[in-house]
């Protein structure tokens, strides 16, 4: 669809004659008809299939045609055509006088004609104006001619329609050969798909408008790159939505039970060696001097009963020194100079001599030690009991009083609260450092999963397209883990991709 | 050849909700060529457009409906729905569910036969 | 709102006849116009989309034009299965907005 249009420029009859050379009376009031048509090698009369169009009187003999582009005398005339433009032409000029105002062709006598003039040829659509003069014997013509689209028409022929739109079904305007231009942000046949914001992860996220970025379920940030871990993961991270891969030091299914309390916590003191045994549990080894659970009591170095022979010792600030009875000297009260004539062994203790009597030892009862059978056998020097157990003496052997928590001969064995099978309808149990936690399996809850609950909500398979279903444990609820190219909670809508 | 089908309709107490589906067959509701839209006729009275949906779940709705009206998509089932809430008598009207055609500029060029809503006490 | 008003409301024409029918909006010219026939008792059929491309199926007596504020729907040679309803369609924004009908009777 386009128009053709004639826009007169001058035409000239100085004689004021008609083509018969017979002169207008009393001059030639002088108006165009134009006749469009089809290519013809030789134009000749017939329809004008292209279209025709006539002026009012437009001057008398010769005159100058003005612009006008309002009213009946419209310069340049307009000849629509609803079809693809050929590219080849016919035109046929005609300039008439009117005797009178009727200026129909069956009003007017036939040699009423002033001039014919006939052109045909190539023409391109274009917006430039092709300037022509034609010329005769009396008469002369000045025009130009151009084919132009009309609103919304575009191409070398004008046969390709295309109206700009910003709406659901596209969002584009229209280049001059009829193609879409998608406006800023939108791309796709017709325009109508967004591009999401810069860097938007491809699979793991989407977008509705231009710039934005919308996570598919298990995926969070501001491009969607970033996965959501297990609801309740503490100390882990993910490399897919829904893990919870445990940071060095944690265990347990939400990453939340300390494996390293060494480290976490930092509890010997004084210097001592710290050694995990378990879930927050821990062994430390005190330096010399040092005693306690955390090695948090400093020992005096007396404590250790260094004195022999029933030497007192007394603390000094560089150690200790021993005060040795009669008959005793040396360091620690260990050499004697008492001989068995002395009787120097206690609580039934027999002496023998040694070193021809210089010497002597005794070999003492059950329960009693030293040099001199001086000392009750105290079993708990050694400090057998672990885990800040209390030793006790009781006559020829001893016994450790635990701390809460612990067992064992010595106190080596940490009490699980689990011990029990606290959990029922096959909770998993978890020991706390202040009790215990049951994780309990689908369909049931409370405390000691003693609760039935609703079933596993991944057992009605919710998830399409082949999604991964995963139960949320602490909601009763599933989230569906979507594979590339689906969308929604169900992972149920395709995602049309680029 | 692709054929849409209406289902839902009845009669419904006013102030009450309904919901219809639109069963497409023969062709995949995912296709990014179309548009699936719902629209309205009173009875003898003219076309009402109430909305439509893309496949990613896009929707639009006529302003003068959009308060009361919601439009989903089933990918899997390769259907979409129309819910509508607070009914009122003036909602009585068949209701049919389209395609419409990016390629033909938005024009519905396959519809449903339509599923007869009566909203009365 | 927009709105497409159609004229006349109800035509009755002889078979053989041409029938003009015509939709009005502001600027309508600018968007893109669909024209349904909807008989009796069935759902409505495209005729005519983008102002003036015919479906498959469609006979070529139906025709349409779109350019100012009038959008037109012709049917060069009226047949008696014709007879039915015919309701323009243009969308504004993101709203589809349909003209009130035009009744088309055989005299």
């Known amino acids: 669809s386009g128009v053709f249009q004639l826009q007169l420029q001058e035409f000239i009859n100085e004689r004021g004659v008609l083509a018969s050379g017979r002169p207008c009376e009393p001059g030639c009031r002088t108006f165009f008809r134009v006749c469009l048509k089809h290519f013809q090698a030789v134009v000749s009369p017939g329809p004008c299939t292209f279209g025709t169009v006539s002026t009012p009187v437009l001057g008398t003999n010769s005159f100058a045609v003005r612009d006008d582009s309002s009213g009946g005398g419209r310069n340049p005339l307009q000849l629509p055509f609803n079809f693809t433009w050929p590219g080849t032409f016919s035109l046929i000029i005609e300039a008439w006088h009117a005797p009178g105002d009727d200026l129909r062709p069956e009003a007017l006598p036939p040699d009423a004609l002033i001039s014919k003039i006939a052109i045909q040829g190539s023409l391109a659509v274009g917006q430039n104006w092709l300037l022509d003069e034609q010329t005769s014997t009396l008469t002369r013509l000045r025009y130009s001619y151009r084919v132009i689209c009309s609103d919304n028409y575009y191409g070398d022929n004008c046969s390709r329609l295309c109206k700009k739109r910003n709406d659901h079904f596209g969002h584009y305007v229209c280049q001059p050969d009829g193609n879409l231009s998608c406006l800023p942000g939108w791309t796709g046949e017709y325009c109508q798909q967004p591009i999401c914001l810069s860097g938007c992860h491809e699979q793991n996220g989407y977008c509705s408008k231009p710039a934005e970025c919308l996570c598919r379920p298990g995926w969070q940030g501001r491009l969607c790159n970033e996965c959501i871990p297990h609801n309740g993961c503490r100390h882990g991270t993910c490399s897919t939505p829904w893990q919870c891969t445990c940071d060095e030091g944690w265990g347990g299914l939400f990453c939340d039970q300390d494996l390293n309390y060494c480290t976490h916590h930092s509890p010997c003191k004084n210097g001592a060696t710290c050694s995990n045994s378990g879930q927050r549990s821990y062994t430390c080894t005190c330096r010399p001097g040092y005693t306690g659970v955390d090695c948090e009591l400093e020992l005096s170095e007396c404590d250790s009963n260094p004195c022999r022979n029933g030497g007192s010792c007394k603390d000094q600030e560089d150690g200790y020194h021993c005060l040795c009875p009669p008959g005793y000297y040396g360091l620690h009260c260990e050499h004697s100079t008492l001989s068995c004539a002395d009787s120097p062994c206690f609580n039934g203790g027999s002496c023998r001599e040694r070193n021809q009597g210089a010497n002597y030892a005794c070999e003492c009862p059950p329960n009693f030690t030293g040099s001199n059978c001086e000392k009750k056998v105290d079993r708990c020097t050694s400090n057998p009991c672990a885990n800040g157990g209390q030793c006790l003496n009781r006559g020829p052997s001893r016994m450790c009083r635990c701390r809460p928590g612990f067992t064992g001969t010595y106190c080596e064995l940490h009490v699980s609260d689990c011990a029990r099978n606290p959990c029922a309808h096959g909770g998993t149990c978890h020991d706390l450092e202040n009790g215990l936690m049951c994780t309990c399996p689908a369909g049931f809850s409370g405390r000691r999963c003693e609760v039935r609950t609703s079933i596993d909500a991944c057992a009605s398979s919710p998830c399409f397209n082949r999604a991964t279903c995963y139960t949320d444990l602490s909601t009763d609820t599933f989230v569906c883990n979507c594979p590339y190219g689906f969308v929604g909670s169900r992972c149920e809508f395709p995602v049309g991709l680029p | 050849e692709v054929q849409l089908v209406e289902s839902g309709g009845g009669l419904v107490q006013p102030g009450r909700s309904l919901r219809l589906s639109c069963a497409v067959s023969g062709g995949s509701i995912s296709s990014s060529s179309y548009y699936w839209g719902w629209i309205r006729q009173a009875p003898g009275k003219g076309l009402e457009w109430i909305g439509d949906?893309?496949?990613?779940?896009?929707?639009y709705y006529n302003p003068s409906l959009k308060s009361r009206v919601t439009i989903s998509v089933d990918t899997a089932k390769n259907s979409f729905y129309l819910q509508m809430n607070s009914l009122r008598a003036e909602d009585t009207a068949v209701y049919y569910c389209a395609r419409q055609a990016l390629a033909m500029g938005g024009g519905s060029d396959k519809w449903g036969q339509g599923t007869l809503v009566t909203v009365s006490s | 709102d927009y709105q497409l008003t159609q004229s006349p409301s109800s035509l009755s024409a002889s078979v053989g006849d041409r029938v003009t029918i015509t939709c009005s909006g502001q600027r309508l010219g600018d968007k893109y116009a669909s024209w349904y026939q909807q008989k009796p008792g069935k759902s409505p059929k495209l005729v005519i989309y983008?102002?003036?491309k015919r479906p498959s199926g469609i006979p070529s007596r139906f025709s349409g034009s779109n350019s100012g504020d009038d959008a037109t729907l012709t049917i060069s040679s009226l047949q008696p299965e014709d007879v039915a309803t015919y309701y323009c369609q243009a969308w504004d924004r993101d709203t589809g907005v349909f003209g009130q009908g035009t009744k088309v009777e055989i005299k």
């Open positions: 949906i893309y496949y990613t779940g896009s929707t």
């Open positions: 983008e102002d003036s």
